[in-house]
């Protein structure tokens, strides 16, 4: 059982009220988490909570404001990036969200030394992407998809790329497929770490196809949006990294770096660039069959002037029983020797482990071990590692920091966090200052979210950073929901669920139980975090028992589990799903006549198949923004896990596990489709072949769209939506309003 | 030492055809950005055109941009200048030179072409 | 694109004189991007100052350049009679590279 804020007595509990949908709205209970802005070892900013930028430096206890929030707010500023050699600051502004991660924005480069703004040679607006050097105060930045260089703030340009053109080619920054499925930046360029050198990426998308939609807007006409987007099996963008000499750019030029044969030899992808010095850059390079990838280093031969990548310096990473890697192929942490690395694969076990790679991946020296997954390297120094896991008491959606001493041998573990604040902490993430000689410790949860300061050395707690007091006390007398994290073991799979109980839950009474489904491939639904959310709100007020099940597919628990739904995406995933409610079932709580279940994108797809199962479990469900065939879907995403939709591949698999195929099915279940017509990422074309194809079949079902809304539905539609859920899943269940 | 060694020039007529070549030695060529840059008799330096090691990017001067290509063959240690359409005012020594946007530090002696009826 | 306007057109000096010729171009450049190069009748340009300012190899000291922005200059501090040529600046900061019009410098 996982404790949240202690209740009070029996005396107080009329002073005691339950979640309403307006406070999940309005975000009534809404965290804060503090990660440092470190700029050095010892040193780093933070923006007030009156939008100063202030330097604090651990060392000596002082802080002082670098800018003031009237110089933000001359410019209005929404974000601010301090050069390396603290002359200069560059402040942004008119964001501009364009996809998940991208933006354009308006940048001024304010000048500390003299207190002004830098004019002369101003940059021009919107800019794509903008950077420092990591050394210095040289800017590299993104406009009109080319790239261009200033060795100072004031000085002219030098334009790299002359290429760029809008869905067209890329340069310094990722196309559509690229930053949603690949890299999960906005950026596709990387300084080398003392600024000699600049790589980026060229994505070339002349022969994508276009994805084309109607954005209606306020004009007498709709404008069409155009979006070069490889469906499974379409042709992908062509990709190429080069290398320029930022000191003398104009002499040389790029360098193109050379892509390994064994991955030249067909379709691929650039998965990503590491620097280790300024004379070696690391490569990822991955088959468009995904399941092989290759690390590729690369050094600079100044007699030749070029980007030497020998096959000896090749490091091969392949599966056999799925995909390469996790979600994504996973990125090297060099060592101090800047040729070997440590980098997180499966084991001979099945689970994704940390191995220290000296020469060959064969000759790999297991670092950690056990049926337990490393998640994430964080830092390496000359003596220690600093990684998270799921290890500590065997559960999975838990997350640990740990340091393994790298300096000794044999090389000995501590877990930093598993007993600091053992009921309140079970999920954390880190951030570490230069030579990890400070870090921030932020936990998610269960309890508050706390973010904590901590000696590199000695892992002392220094100081709280934002321990979300307000929000304590605003929950004082609120009257949360239960929550409880088990397991459930059937036919060999464990699988584990998160179940929301009403505060007053009484096991010998009967309750509404609703799914929430994601169930993606590698993905984690039943994590040890706070969440104060429409699902808490649905058992606080509603009486409604909320469960999330980690099925197979789904991440951290081994490679038998995660690789299990390879190639045949639908089916196990929907399984597991009902096999849990059976179990539940059976638990003796749950009225069986009112189940629902809903879920968003992949939930959406997982929740159709489960309503459209046969199995009569399910009274009603929604899906939202749901992806209906993988036909659909973007490649890099869809073909690393179904393969391709040939007759000589997965083609079968691909039309049998389309939500269409199931219309017929959905005559007993209440549905509701939910999605936004300006959905970039799963087209509205999903649910209008859903919709037809429930018309065809002359199945009656409920809809709602939201003009020009994307995937996340934002802003006013997040209030009508969860508005029209609730509605939905109270009359289903029989709930009064 | 580095050597450059331009050919292939000589006479032609207005809309005619020729291709110049650069036969380089001494270092790695392709490594190496190269351009070709002109000089018309009298006349001052045109950049004219430039391509980087691999032969992966290219870029012209507004004046030959549609009519000239430049190519490399880099087994071959061999640069290319394929001009067509050829115009009175091409006419001009024609140098390959060794560099990107600047710094040319190595030039070859130059060939000729001229262009007229 | 930039021009590039080099002045006087010609200079006509003693052997063992300083010469200063000048470069000023449209827009600014930054010494990152300027070279300069030297001409004799009937041969190939030979580069003199690199982009960045520094003097290409093989290049005497007396040779030296300066300047930042729009505004340059080649410094020959004693001229030796094989000085005596063309001499043009060049930029590289922009597409397309774009060369001055040259400095001719006699012997007086």
């Known amino acids: 059982i996982v404790l949240r804020p202690s209740r009070v007595h029996n005396s107080e509990e009329n002073t005691m009220r339950a979640l309403t949908l307006k406070d999940i709205l309005n975000g009534t209970f809404s965290y804060k988490t503090f990660f440092p802005n470190w700029i050095s070892g010892q040193e780093y900013l933070h923006q007030s909570a009156d939008n100063n930028i202030v330097l604090y430096n651990i060392e000596t206890g002082q802080s002082y404001t670098i800018l003031s929030n009237r110089t933000m707010k001359s410019v209005n500023a929404s974000n601010y990036g301090l050069s390396p050699d603290r002359q200069f600051v560059y402040l942004e502004s008119d964001y501009s969200k364009l996809w998940r991660y991208s933006y354009t924005a308006t940048y001024y480069i304010y000048d500390l030394s003299n207190g002004e703004f830098v004019r002369g040679n101003e940059l021009p607006r919107p800019i794509q992407y903008l950077c420092w050097s990591p050394v210095g105060s040289k800017l590299a930045y993104v406009y009109q998809n080319n790239i261009y260089l200033k060795q100072r703030p004031g000085d002219p340009p030098f334009q790299i790329t002359f290429n760029g053109r809008e869905n067209k080619i890329f340069n310094g920054i990722p196309d559509w497929v690229y930053e949603e499925e690949m890299l999960a930046t906005k950026y596709a360029l990387w300084w080398s770490p003392n600024g000699k050198f600049l790589a980026y990426a060229e994505f070339n998308d002349t022969d994508i196809p276009v994805i084309a939609y109607s954005y209606y807007g306020d004009e007498q006409y709709p404008r069409t949006i155009n979006i070069p987007y490889p469906k499974a099996g379409a042709k992908n963008p062509v990709v190429r990294i080069f290398i320029i000499d930022t000191t003398y750019p104009a002499y040389v030029g790029p360098q193109e770096v050379p892509v390994p044969a064994m991955i030249a030899s067909s379709d691929y992808y650039f998965s990503w660039l590491t620097w280790v010095t300024d004379e070696r850059v690391c490569l990822q390079w991955l088959k468009r069959v995904q399941n092989v990838s290759v690390l590729s280093i690369c050094d600079f031969r100044e007699d030749w002037q070029t980007w030497d990548c020998p096959k000896t310096q090749e490091h091969i990473e392949e599966s056999r029983t799925g995909w390469a890697g996790g979600f994504f192929v996973s990125t090297p942490v060099f060592s101090y020797d800047a040729i070997s690395y440590y980098k997180i694969f499966s084991d001979k076990d099945g689970y994704k482990h940390i191995h220290y790679i000296k020469d060959t991946v064969e000759n790999a020296i297991q670092i950690t071990s056990g049926k337990w997954e490393a998640i994430n390297i964080f830092r390496v120094t000359q003596d220690s590692l600093f990684y998270s896991s799921n290890e500590f008491e065997e559960y999975p959606g838990r997350r640990n920091i740990y340091r393994i001493s790298i300096g000794s041998y044999p090389p000995s573990k501590k877990c930093v966090t598993c007993h600091l604040r053992k009921e309140r902490c079970q999920y954390y993430t880190a951030s570490f200052s230069d030579y990890a000689k400070y870090y921030a410790l932020v936990c998610y949860g269960p309890g508050i979210p706390i973010s904590t300061l901590h000696d590199g050395r000695t892992d002392q707690e220094i100081k709280i950073l934002e321990e979300n007091k307000e929000l304590e006390n605003a929950l004082k007398n609120i009257q949360l929901p239960k929550e409880e994290i088990k397991k459930l073991e059937v036919d060999e799979i464990t699988l584990w669920y998160k179940m929301i109980l009403p505060p007053q839950f009484d096991r010998s009474k009967k309750y509404p139980l609703l799914i929430q489904v994601y169930g993606g491939p590698c993905s984690q639904s039943v994590r040890s975090v706070f969440a104060v959310n429409w699902i808490s709100y649905l058992a606080s007020k509603e009486g409604m028992v909320i469960a999330l099940v980690d099925g197979r597919g789904t991440a951290f628990q081994g490679d038998k589990l995660l690789y299990a739904v390879y190639r045949k995406l639908g089916v196990y995933e929907v399984e597991d799903q009902i096999t849990a409610v059976r179990k539940f079932i059976e638990m003796g709580f749950i009225d069986e006549k009112r189940i629902a279940i809903w879920g968003w994108s992949y939930g959406g797809y997982v929740s159709s198949l489960a309503l459209a199962s046969g199995t009569g479990l399910f009274k009603c469900g929604i899906a939202v923004a749901p992806v209906s065939s993988w036909e659909y879907y973007a490649s890099v995403y869809t073909e690393r896990f179904m393969g391709l939709p040939t007759k000589d591949d997965n083609l079968e698999h691909y039309k049998n596990s389309t939500v269409m195929a199931r219309a017929e099915y959905f005559r007993n279940v209440d549905y509701l489709l939910i999605h936004g017509t300006a959905d970039d990422n799963v087209h509205f074309q999903n649910s209008a072949q859903i919709a037809k194809a429930l018309v065809n079949a002359q199945v009656d079902f409920q809809a709602m769209w939201y003009s020009d809304q994307n995937h996340g539905l934002s802003g006013l539609s997040t209030n009508h939506l969860y508005t029209h859920m609730t509605h939905f899943l109270k009359q289903c269940f029989s709930l009064s309003d | 030492e580095v050597q450059l060694l331009e050919s292939g020039g000589g006479l032609v007529q207005p809309g005619g055809s020729l291709r110049l070549s650069c036969a380089a030695s001494?270092?790695?060529?392709?490594?190496?950005?190269m351009s070709w840059v002109r000089q018309a008799p009298g006349k001052g330096l045109e950049w004219v055109s430039g391509i980087i090691g691999s032969g992966g990017i290219t870029y012209y001067a507004d004046s030959v941009k549609g009519r000239f290509t430049i190519s490399r063959d880099n087994s071959k240690n061999t640069l290319y200048l394929q001009m067509n359409s050829l115009r009175a005012e091409d006419t001009a020594v024609y140098y390959c030179?060794?560099?990107?946007?600047?710094?040319?530090?190595?030039w070859g002696q130059g060939t000729l072409v001229t262009v007229s009826s | 694109e930039i021009v590039l306007t080099q002045s006087p057109g010609t200079l006509s000096l003693s052997p063992g004189e300083r010469a200063t010729l000048s470069c000023r171009a449209s827009?600014?450049?930054?010494?990152?991007?300027l070279a300069w190069y030297q001409q004799k009748p009937g041969q190939a340009p030979r580069l003199l100052i690199n982009v960045g300012s520094r003097r290409a190899t093989g290049i005497p000291d007396r040779f030296s350049g300066s300047g930042s922005g729009t505004d340059f200059t080649l410094t020959i501090s004693r001229l030796e009679p094989e000085d005596f040529a063309v001499y043009y600046c060049?930029?590289?900061?922009?597409?397309?590279?774009?060369f001055g019009q040259g400095t001719k410098v006699e012997i007086k």
């Open positions: 060049q930029q590289g900061i922009m597409l397309p590279p774009t």
């Open positions: 030179a060794k560099g990107w946007f600047g710094g040319f530090n190595y």
């Open positions: 001494g270092f790695t060529f392709s490594s190496y950005a």
């Open positions: 827009q600014s450049v930054t010494s990152s991007y």
